[in-house]
């Protein structure tokens, strides 16, 4: 195909790929009609003057995963048609000024995963058509004012995984077309007011894994198109009352792994499109009424691994679309009988790893569609008569690791469990804690007459029978709603953002994928 170097493969579609450790310089001669060139996993350490001079039709150039540490300023001369240039995963510490001069068609520039120490306004001043700039995974400590001033068409900018300690409020001011800005995994401690004011078209802002302690009240007030806001794993201890007030398009908000002690009423909203709210791993101690009442479309609410000891009866007002509620691993001892009354569409609720001693008889009265209830590892000794009777879709109920008191009062619950064993799962069954002579025996098969021989056992009305129908979908443990292998954080929309963690610790987790955390 017009002369293909021996170290490369060339396709009829004008695509050239050169790979291998034996390559130490840009192979020649390259086909003059090449439109795509990939130089991957080689031992090339430098790019000299004009190695691509004879392939001026080139549209995409990937020079990735090499030993590249030095580039001559004129290396990309004569590539006026180039639209995509990736120098990612190399060893570049310095970019020569004028390196991208003449690349008038360039739309995507990937410089990620190098060792760049600084960038200057002159580096990108010629790239007026650039739409995407990837600078994540470098060693940048600051971004000078004016660095991006000429990139008025930029829609995606990734500065994640650098060493940025502060951001100038002017650095993004000309990026009115920017849709995605990623600043995750830096060392930012605060973000000045006005930093994002010019970003009127921003749809995604990733600020997770920094050291942000305080958010300015009006930080996001100009970002009316923001859809995804990632603030997890910072040091945020309080949220200014109006900080999320102007975000009507937001559908994803992550705040897990911060130091939030309280959620002031009205803090979230109005956010009519928010579907998921991740608040696990904070220090929240109570939930006041109406704290989520503006989140009418919320489907997933994760409040696990906090210190919640009090939930006001109207805390979940407005959450009529909620499907998943995770409250596990908190300090709950009491639940008001009305607390879940508004959650008509709830399917999964996790209450495990709390200190619940009893449940109100009508706690699930309005929540007819419940499919999974996690109550393991609490302080429950018994449950009220008929608490699960109306839950026809219930297919997973976890009751183990509670100090069940197997006296005559347990009979109604025992009888109901006997009829509904498949819902309990096969791995761990509830066992008696008291009296001492039956401790450790299965609650389901215990003979209550033996358990309390000195007590006359009256006729106790059994729980009304809710038979286990074979055609109801049962979840074997391998595919259980509370599978033990789970995601511990929401999966962001891009792989360079989040590490997916896996755990097998059943006592900590036991949640659906969305509820995990």
């Amino acid at each position: 195909y017009h002369g293909c170097p021996s170290e490369c493969t060339c396709s009829r579609a004008s695509q050239v790929e050169c790979t291998g450790a034996r390559i130490v310089a840009v192979p020649t001669p390259l086909p003059w009609n090449a439109m795509s060139l990939q130089i991957l996993n080689t031992h090339i350490t430098e790019l000299n003057e004009s190695p691509f001079l004879n392939i001026s039709a080139l549209i995409a150039l990937r020079i990735e995963k090499n030993e590249l540490s030095r580039i001559t300023p004129g290396a990309f001369r004569n590539l006026g048609s180039l639209r995509y240039l990736s120098l990612a995963n190399n060893k570049l510490q310095v970019l020569p000024i004028g390196l991208f001069q003449g690349l008038d068609s360039l739309e995507s520039l990937l410089l990620s995963s190098n060792q760049l120490l600084q960038i200057q306004p002159a580096h990108f001043s010629q790239c007026s058509n650039l739409k995407e700039l990837q600078l994540h995974g470098n060693h940048l400590e600051y971004i000078p004012d004016g660095a991006f001033d000429h990139l008025v068409g930029l829609t995606k900018l990734n500065l994640g995984k650098n060493s940025l300690t502060h951001i100038s409020p002017r650095v993004f001011q000309h990026l009115g077309n920017l849709q995605v800005l990623r600043l995750y995994e830096n060392r930012l401690t605060d973000i000045p007011m006005g930093t994002f004011d010019g970003l009127v078209n921003l749809q995604e802002l990733a600020l997770q894994q920094n050291q942000i302690g305080l958010l300015s009240p009006g930080l996001f007030h100009n970002n009316h198109n923001l859809q995804r806001l990632y603030l997890s794993n910072n040091h945020i201890s309080q949220l200014p009352p109006s900080v999320f007030m102007q975000l009507p398009q937001l559908n994803r908000l992550t705040l897990f792994g911060n130091s939030l002690k309280e959620l002031s009423p009205g803090i979230f909203g109005p956010m009519p499109n928010l579907r998921e709210l991740w608040l696990y791993d904070n220090h929240i101690s109570s939930l006041p009424d109406n704290v989520f009442s503006n989140l009418r479309q919320l489907q997933v609410l994760i409040l696990s691994r906090n210190q919640i000891s009090f939930i006001s009866p109207g805390a979940f007002n407005g959450l009529t679309e909620l499907r998943e509620l995770s409250l596990h691993t908190n300090a709950l001892q009491d639940l008001d009988g009305n607390v879940f009354r508004m959650l008509a569409n709830l399917q999964n609720i996790s209450l495990q790893n709390n200190r619940l001693r009893q449940l109100p008889g009508n706690i699930f009265a309005n929540v007819n569609g419940l499919m999974a209830i996690q109550l393991q590892n609490n302080q429950l000794e018994n449950l009220p008569l008929g608490i699960f009777d109306h839950l026809g879709k219930l297919c997973e109920l976890r009751l183990y690791d509670n100090p069940w008191r197997c006296d005559s009062d347990i009979l109604p619950l025992r009888n109901w469990l006997l009829l509904n064993q498949p819902r309990l799962g096969t791995d761990t069954v509830p066992v008696c804690f008291s009296p001492a002579n039956v401790r450790g025996q299965s609650l389901i098969i215990i003979n209550v007459n033996v358990a309390v021989p000195s007590v006359h056992v009256p006729e106790v009305p059994s729980y009304p029978e809710t038979p286990w129908y074979p055609d109801t979908p049962s979840y074997p443990d391998t595919t259980s709603v509370s599978s033990t292998t789970e995601l511990t954080s929401p999966v962001e929309d891009y792989t360079d953002l989040t590490t997916i963690q896996v755990t097998d610790d059943r006592s900590v987790w036991g949640m659906t994928q969305a509820q995990s955390g």
Epitope: I267, S286, P288, D289, V291, D334, G361
Partner: antibody
């Protein structure tokens, strides 16, 4: 229907204690928080604290902490508020009240007048 | 503690009048404000909760509005049975606190 019936008026001397009862009916007593609120003559209403009858857990207004004790007898569906070290400014009508679908007071007892006078 | 400042402390009005009572919280309480009516020798009666929702059985002439720190109770057309004292209450954070009351008297 939900009803809260309180004990009768009391006259106490300064330094003494008073225990006011509140008998609940018309709902499952153990399932809902019960609060105590007081109103001194010509003064605003003051929230004193709550109890969750199912567990006996309590929360008190710091202003009364150490002097107020809220308890319950689940077998009698009754909550109690005891105020010790009474002073003349504790002269007030004491109400028990139950929350509804939020932390506002939907159901009230009729009130118990406690007069502290030497 | 969150202070609830109610005004006026008293007002005189005639049957049919429109009456407005305001309540100002010392810090943001979202919509967690309730309004009560109290008549002499009686327990308070819940009128409005969540700032603007009428309690069951409360006539439509009573309405509430506001959020954050400023709240209003309006009686659109005062009736003879409405002469009473009205209190606002915040239930956003402990300790829950009440306003000082507004006494609505016959002019």
């Amino acid at each position: 229907q939900v009803q809260l019936v309180q004990s009768g008026a009391e006259v106490k001397k300064p330094g003494a204690s008073v225990k006011v009862s509140c008998k609940a009916s018309g709902y499952t007593f153990t399932d809902y928080y019960i609060n105590w609120v007081r109103q001194a003559p010509g003064q605003r209403l003051e929230w004193m604290g709550w109890i969750y009858p199912g567990s006996g857990n309590t929360k008190y207004n710091e202003k009364f902490k150490g002097r107020v004790t809220i308890t319950r007898d689940t077998s009698a569906s009754t909550a109690y508020m005891e105020l010790s070290s009474l002073r003349s400014e504790d002269t007030a009508v004491y109400y028990c009240a139950r929350w509804g679908y939020g932390a506002y007071f939907t159901y009230w007892g009729q009130g118990t007048l406690v007069t502290v006078s030497s | 503690d969150i202070q609830m400042t109610q005004s006026p402390s008293s007002l005189s009005a005639s049957v049919g009048d429109r009456v407005t009572i305001t309540c100002k919280a010392s810090q943001n309480v979202g919509i967690n404000v309730a309004w009560y009516q109290q008549k002499p020798g009686k327990a308070p009666k819940l009128l409005i909760y969540s700032a603007s929702y009428r309690s069951s059985g409360v006539p439509s002439r009573f309405s509430g509005s506001g959020s954050g720190t400023d709240f209003t109770l309006t009686i659109s057309s005062l009736q003879p049975e409405d002469f009473a004292t009205y209190y606002c209450q915040q239930y956003s954070s402990f300790p829950y606190t009440f306003g000082g009351g507004t006494k609505v008297e016959i002019k």
